[in-house]
């Protein structure tokens, strides 16, 4: 009964002044929630930014993130003999990425079809919960990994079993914390029907009164507690690590280790600059503007920032590459379409010669791991 011709295809929690609230009266009658979607909001929801740019980025993230994190998780769980804290944190990082990325086909379809969500309320809530959950999980596990990397340099000797148990405990605590802090995202109604556009949005238009006040408070709390504080810890760890590496003796092995450490630091810095800082900053600014002015002037930037935050699922594999010898081997061989066993057989003589000449204390193969730089 309707034709929607999309000739020049043109929100998250769109821009609207909230005109009323959803509440249950004393008699148990639900009063309809009122939200505001205006011409600008409508043009964003039908525009190329949301219907072309977002699905392209999400497709790239899915195509790169799914196999790379899938392989990483497989390597860390089944191909790494010694489960060091770094391996545990990276396995959790890969799991967080996978839990987010597996839903991307629905997200891509949603945006391609003009921001029209046809998969039901529950799936929308899961998608959004996992979307934000992944970002905050990544920040926290990256912090743990960074602190652990520094700790290994400062204190290379330590009880592996005890360290591994601590890492498992910390990881479980992080998952529990993220589950708790994302509860509001699962509880809030995320799907809204927009009559003028004949679409049902998922998270792009939020109806609740909490959009104005509570959403600002919520994302401000997350930005401080789950972004700024971990970011400070990560930065501190790397600054101290650079100092330690500068002052250390410079043999061939140390030089290789230092170069890989610098690559890791650059990768993590890039992740913060591209993924975490813009999204957390704009989440707060966006909701602050809605709260104070009734609309957000940074909506397009906010959309782009949240979209770019998903790139952490593509950048994380580079972290695994610089930290884990096992992942490096499997990644190289996967790209060259060779089996690890064949390569290892070919390199047996070379490896034995190298090991006889060099100290193995910094090797990070699955057999002799002390530190994995």
């Amino acid at each position: 009964t309707i034709q929607g011709t999309n000739r020049s295809s043109k929100g998250r929690s769109l821009i609207g002044k909230v005109d009323g609230t959803s509440h249950v009266t004393g008699k148990g009658v639900t009063v309809e929630t009122v939200f505001s979607v205006d011409e600008f909001s409508a043009s964003v929801l039908t525009g190329k930014l949301t219907t072309v740019f977002l699905p392209i980025v999400y497709t790239i993230v899915f195509v790169v993130g799914l196999p790379s994190n899938g392989m990483a998780l497989w390597v860390f769980l089944f191909r790494t003999k010694k489960k060091h804290p770094a391996v545990i944190y990276m396995a959790n990082l890969a799991l967080a990425d996978l839990l987010s990325v597996i839903w991307f086909p629905l997200k891509i379809a949603y945006h391609i079809h003009g921001n029209n969500w046809i998969y039901g309320e529950a799936l929308c809530n899961v998608l959004i919960g996992f979307f934000y959950g992944n970002m905050y999980c990544s920040i926290l596990f990256m912090t743990c990994l960074s602190v652990q990397r520094y700790w290994v340099i400062v204190n290379p000797m330590g009880h592996s079993r005890k360290k591994a148990n601590i890492a498992i405990g910390i990881s479980l605590a992080i998952w529990l914390l993220i589950l708790l802090v994302t509860i509001p995202l699962y509880v809030v109604k995320q799907t809204i029907f927009i009559p003028a556009l004949n679409i049902t949005t998922c998270h792009d238009v939020l109806p609740e009164q909490l959009l104005v006040g509570d959403m600002f408070n919520y994302f401000l709390s997350l930005a401080i507690g789950v972004f700024l504080f971990p970011a400070f810890l990560t930065a501190s760890a790397y600054v101290l690590m650079i100092r330690m590496l500068r002052s250390s003796a410079m043999d061939e092995n140390s030089e290789k280790k230092r170069k890989r450490a610098i690559k890791l630091i650059v990768t993590v810095l890039a992740m913060y600059l591209i993924c975490f800082t813009p999204s957390n900053l704009l989440l707060v600014v966006h909701y602050f503007l809605i709260k104070s002015q009734g609309q957000s002037h940074v909506y397009a930037l906010y959309i782009v920032a949240l979209c770019l935050s998903t790139l952490n699922s593509c950048i994380d594999p580079f972290v695994y590459y610089f930290v884990s010898h096992d992942f490096r081997d499997h990644a190289k061989n996967a790209l060259l379409c060779r089996s690890v066993r064949t390569v290892k057989q070919m390199q047996v003589s070379l490896t034995s010669k190298k090991h006889s000449r060099k100290s193995s204390s910094y090797s990070s193969s699955s057999t002799t791991v002390k530190t994995s730089y």
Partner: antibody, heavy 121, light 107 residues
Framework: EVQLVESGGGLVQPGRSLKLSCVAS????????MTWIRQAPGKGLEWVAS????????YYPDSVKGRFTVSRDSAKSTLYLQMNSLRSEDTATYYC??????????????WGQGTLVTVSS | DIQMTQSPHSLSASLGETVSIECLAS??????LAWFQQKPGKSPQLLIY???SLQDGVPSRFSGSGSGTQYSLKISNMQPEDEGVYYC?????????FGGGTELELK
């Protein structure tokens, strides 16, 4: 002051085509959705077509889908309705409206004076 | 398509009287309802949108109410300039549809 002036109406034979124009003034044309609504003589109102402010999307009821095309020219602040394969039941006064998107729906806030289209042999 | 049924078809009211026009939708329209007034030989004019929000410049004697499928327009203190045909229109699902109209005249 918002002004919408329709033109292009007249007598036309069944099966022929006609193009209606609506010149807008007194507001920023690019900021608003626009709509065509018709009213057959002595009858009620019928929605005919809507177009988004960017012109990127158009919406039609089944009764005119495939025959009518709504378009807009931002430079001229003009809305158009190209009517092909006209039928006698298309005889009506055609109104051009400037819409507001409020709470996610389209509301026909300003109306032109209308232009009469008569389809008869 | 959503069918909009108006009642009564026509009514007369005295000066200062309060009148009410009903509009019934064939399915729930979540308050996405507008009311228009059309005076003889003139274009329609938006009075009420979103069931109860008064359009700018419209006298406060006009008010809208309702929910679900049933909506009404109330004109308190009937004035001579209120004569005309009143239409309801749903803006919930395409195609947008109008009621058949209610003719209001002064007694």
């Amino acid at each position: 002051e918002v002004q919408l002036v329709e033109s292009g109406g007249g007598l036309v034979q069944p099966g022929r085509s006609l193009k209606l124009s609506c010149v807008a003034s007194g507001f920023t044309f690019n900021n608003y959705w626009m709509t065509w609504i018709r009213q057959a003589p002595g009858k009620g109102l019928e929605w005919v077509a809507s177009i988004t402010n960017s012109g990127g999307r158009t919406y039609y009821p089944d009764s005119v889908k495939g025959r009518f095309t709504v378009s807009r020219d931002s430079a001229k602040s003009t809305l158009y309705l190209q009517m092909n394969s006209l039928r006698s039941e298309d005889t009506a006064t055609y109104y051009c409206t400037r819409d507001r998107i409020i709470r996610g729906s389209t509301w026909f806030t300003y109306w032109g004076q209308g232009t009469l289209v008569t389809v008869s042999s | 398509d959503i069918q909009m049924t108006q009642s009564p078809h026509s009514l007369s009211a005295s000066l200062g009287e309060t009148v009410s026009i009903e509009c019934l939708a064939s399915e729930g329209i979540s308050n996405y309802l507008a009311w228009f007034q059309q005076k003889p030989g003139k274009s329609p004019q938006l009075l009420i949108y979103y069931a109860s929000s008064l359009q700018d410049g419209v006298p406060s004697r006009f008010s809208g109410s309702g929910s679900g499928t049933q909506y009404s327009l109330k004109i308190s203190n009937m004035q001579p300039e209120d004569e005309g045909v009143y239409y309801c229109q749903q803006g919930y699902k395409y195609p947008w549809t109008f009621g058949g109209g209610t003719e209001l005249e002064l007694k």
